[in-house]
Interface confidence: medium
């Protein structure tokens, strides 16, 4: 199996009640605007075939996509939460910048690409859905990277 290196986040990143609450509130606000409840971006299909030792690397890819393609373009929405949560997630992304997999990561890229394609296909509602799943992103990072 591919070996992941530097794919760790300190537990303290997830022990800050204020930013945790703001992240979850942002997700809630966005999910209220999400009419497509049948589609789940961060779910079984994303994790399929990816072992737990590779999961942090997978979530890093999802985090980076979410920041660059969703949160930055939508940064004027869902205030005041967005202006606090985006820098926090960007710091997590920066801390995972040296997280790599030695070996073939095609199976991971394939799963991430499906998530990206779904968001793109849904257009703005896909971006809203991705923001509405920030709680899942947060918890999946916590579960995989500590």
């Amino acid at each position: 199996a591919p070996i992941s290196s530097h794919c760790r986040l300190d537990k303290s990143n997830f022990q800050q009640p204020y930013i945790t609450n703001r992240t979850f509130m942002l997700a809630k606000e966005a999910s209220l605007a999400d009419n497509n409840t049948d589609v789940r971006l961060i779910g079984e299909k994303l994790f399929h075939g990816v072992s737990m030792s590779e999961r942090c690397y997978l979530m890093k890819q999802v985090l980076n996509f979410t920041l660059e393609e969703v949160l930055f373009p939508q940064s004027d929405r869902f205030q005041p939460y967005m202006q606090e949560v985006v820098p926090f997630l960007a710091r997590l992304s920066n801390r995972l910048s040296t997280c790599h997999i030695e070996g073939d990561d095609l199976h991971i890229q394939r799963n991430v690409q499906k998530l990206k394609d779904t968001v793109k296909k849904l257009g703005e509602s896909g971006e809203i859905k991705a923001i509405g799943e920030l709680d899942l992103l947060f918890m999946s990072l916590r579960n995989a990277c500590i």
Epitope: K11, F14, T20, N21, F24, M25, A27, K28, S31, T37, D38, R40, I42, G43, E44, L46, F47, V50, S51, M52, S53, R55, D135, M139, S140, R142, N143, A144, I146
Partner: antibody
Amino acid sequence: EVQLVESGGGVVRPGGSLRLSCAASGFTFDDYGMNWVRQAPGKGLEWVSGVNWNGGTRDYAASVKGRFTISRDNAKNSLYLQMNSLRAEDTALYYCARGWYSGSFYYFGYWGRGTLVTVSS
Amino acid sequence: QAVLTQPSSVSGSPGQSITISCTGASGDVGAYNFVSWYQQHPGKTPKLIIYDVNKRPSGVSNRFSGSKSGNTASLTISGLQAEDESDYYCSSYTSTFSVVFGGGTKVTVL
């Protein structure tokens, strides 16, 4: 076939300790978060504690925090619950439960048959 | 003490539809889509029948459906059958990284 087999239950006096074990088989143990859920006789379900795949995060219900410790040994495909300072209200059937899919540590898709803990003087 | 509130009992005749409610707070059911439902027959282990508010695990009858509005989640059983007589529990994940359950609802098929 997924199998979860709990052991270690028994009768203990208030203030005493017990260590529960859960032997897992039929799946890649370290791909899943694991949990303990309890059910007092004739009562409803109560989540007790959960641990992520590598033991890095351990979460507890407020009612057991500071008294119970969850741990896992991936090499032995085993989950544990160390219970200290036991109280009468801890009397229950303790279930070992696995996430429904690998990313869902909060949905309990597979359950053991449970091990009974009785706290009585 | 259950954190989520469910009716203690609900009954219906065979073929009917029944709905079980599960009321939480803004920090659990109201905030996130991490609601699940479990069926538990007497003397048996619980069985996951709904997750992600409205998704069914493979093998679970499509007579079971879930939904959520505000702080209240609901489980609907359509075409009620004798084997549906059981206890049902709702559950939600929370922002404090804990899981909360409802007190359970006993479903009786008349």
